[in-house]
């Protein structure tokens, strides 16, 4: 096609995970899939400076057709910010990843004590639950609501009924996953909420309760509801 176009990202989902916490000796791959016309070129920076092969033992691989940078057997000195710069004569775009190389003994995720905290709000109000997670390896985080089916919290197998409200795994590391927002709260939103964090060693979770109170001035309306009439 003759339509000239500045560089653009073709698969932002593959770029959502900005923070990569990787055990020493593992392989790291950063991708910046892009398009443009003419086809853009890609170069990599480490901590804002040109990234050269001699900057690390064993060098690195660039797979231009996959828009990727690959570093094998990472070591602590590989920690830092890696920026892909994709450019053609019509423009330039860039994206930065942060690499942390983990040498500690990996442990199951640790959740900050007291979080999430119990909360209460009135009908129509907003509430947020916060969960702070510390994990050597990238954790996968879920927010879970304990729900009822046919008036029961537990199934015939004795297991609780659960609904995953929000989840993040390999493609997401945004801090927003650590906060669960509930807008325009209803009575049905009351109950137990669980923040679950897992990694390759195990799973940890903390729970909190949401109490929903009638909105001020609505008591009459609630009392007059047909559900309460004989």
């Amino acid at each position: 096609s003759n339509n000239k176009r500045a560089p653009y990202w073709t698969n932002t989902e593959k770029m959502e995970k900005r923070l990569h916490a990787v055990p020493a000796a593992n392989t790291v791959k950063f991708r910046c899939p892009a398009g443009g016309n003419p086809m853009p070129t890609m170069r990599w920076l480490k901590n804002g400076k040109e990234f050269k092969q001699e900057h690390r033992i064993g060098g690195y691989k660039v797979r231009n057709q996959h828009w990727s940078l690959i570093m094998e057997s990472v070591v602590p000195s590989d920690k830092g910010n890696y920026t892909c710069v994709v450019e053609n004569e019509y423009g330039s775009i860039n994206h930065t990843y942060h690499l942390d190389v983990v040498e500690r003994s990996p442990h199951r995720p640790i959740l900050q004590a007291g979080l999430p905290a119990n909360a209460s709000t009135v009908v129509g109000g907003d509430v947020e639950f916060v969960c702070k997670v510390y994990s050597d390896a990238q954790p996968h985080i879920q927010w879970i609501k304990h729900v009822e089916k046919n008036g029961s919290k537990y199934g015939p197998d004795g297991l609780p009924y659960l609904k995953v409200l929000k989840a993040a795994g390999v493609n997401t590391t945004d801090k927003e996953i650590e906060v669960l927002y509930i807008r325009n709260v209803t009575f049905e939103d009351a109950g137990e909420y669980t923040c679950l964090a897992g990694n390759s060693i195990g799973i940890s979770f903390h729970s909190a309760w949401l109490t929903v109170l009638p909105a001020p001035g609505r008591e009459k309306e609630i009392t007059a509801s047909p559900d309460y009439l004989e």
């Epitope: 199951r108 640790i110 996968h140 390759s200 940890s204």
Partner: antibody, heavy 124, light 112 residues
Framework: EVQLLESGGGVVQPGRSLRLSCAAS????????MHWVRQAPGKGLEWVAV????????YYADSVKGRFTISRDNSKNTLSLQMNSLRVEDTAIYYC?????????????????WGQGTMVTVSS | DIVMTQTPLSLSVTPGQPASISCTSS???????????VYWYLQKSGQPPQLLIY???NRFSGVPDRFSGSGSRTDFTLKISRVEAEDVGVYYC?????????FGGGTKVEIK
């Protein structure tokens, strides 16, 4: 039925290589971390390695670091252990063990399901 | 690494009598989520280990209620209230809080 079946064991000379496999069935393999644990003849249990559910994280015991590589193929429900530069002290039964899942667990979060094991003998 | 020390090395028990195995960890296994990550296994001759107790005191499904786990932080105990012939084998404790996961040296239980 949840099952793990190891294969690939055998007799090998010191310095040579061997690749173990573990076929998983009866559960969603791609949602679980997986481990290798070994047991030398007449001895206790020794943890060898773990791989996360998606293969992005791997950890090894110091005794095998740099020689063994754990990997997985979620499309084939298979866990592998590539063992290079084998030593006499690597002689053991190697067990494949299911680790933690990705979601809420009502019960143990892993180390509940073990394979029958495959024997590796390193001898000259 | 967390060291798991198990005692005794072996135990000879009369059927119907109680038995107790101790395990000590070099660091606390009490996690921030309030759980204590010690597991107990029984390995019968020629078989892989089978899970008995998880998270200190929870019996795994299908495990008879004569098995119980207790303890806190660094000191743990597995009790068999009335030993039966099928309980013979080697018992192991394991810490499941950090890698490398580590096991106790094992306690061999036999019937008198």
């Amino acid at each position: 039925e949840v099952q793990l079946l190891e294969s690939g064991g055998g007799v090998v000379q010191p310095g040579r290589s061997l690749r173990l496999s573990c076929a998983a069935s009866g559960f969603t393999f791609s949602s679980y971390a997986m481990h290798w644990v070994r047991q030398a003849p007449g001895k206790g249990l020794e943890w060898v390695a773990v791989i996360s559910y998606d293969g992005s994280n791997k950890y090894y015991a110091d005794s095998v670091k740099g020689r063994f590589t754990i990997s997985r193929d979620n499309s084939k429900n298979t866990l592998s252990l590539q063992m290079n530069s084998l030593r006499v002290e690597d002689t053991a039964i190697y067990y494949c063990v299911r680790g933690a899942g990705r979601g809420y667990t009502y019960g143990p979060d892993g180390f509940d399901i073990w394979g029958q094991g495959t024997m590796v003998t390193v001898s000259s | 690494d967390i060291v798991m020390t198990q005692t005794p090395l072996s135990l000879s028990v009369t059927p119907g009598q109680p038995a107790s195995i101790s395990c000590t960890s070099s660091r606390s296994l009490l996690h921030s989520d309030g759980k204590t990550y010690v597991y107990w296994y029984l390995q019968k001759s020629g078989q892989p280990p089978q899970l008995l107790i998880y998270e200190l005191s929870n019996r795994f499904s299908g495990v008879p209620d004569r098995f119980s786990g207790s303890g806190s932080r660094t000191d743990f105990t597995l009790k068999i209230s009335r030993v039966e012939a099928e309980d013979v084998g080697v018992y192991y404790c394991m810490q499941y809080i950090e890698a490398p996961l580590t096991f106790g040296g094992g306690t061999k239980v036999e019937i008198k």
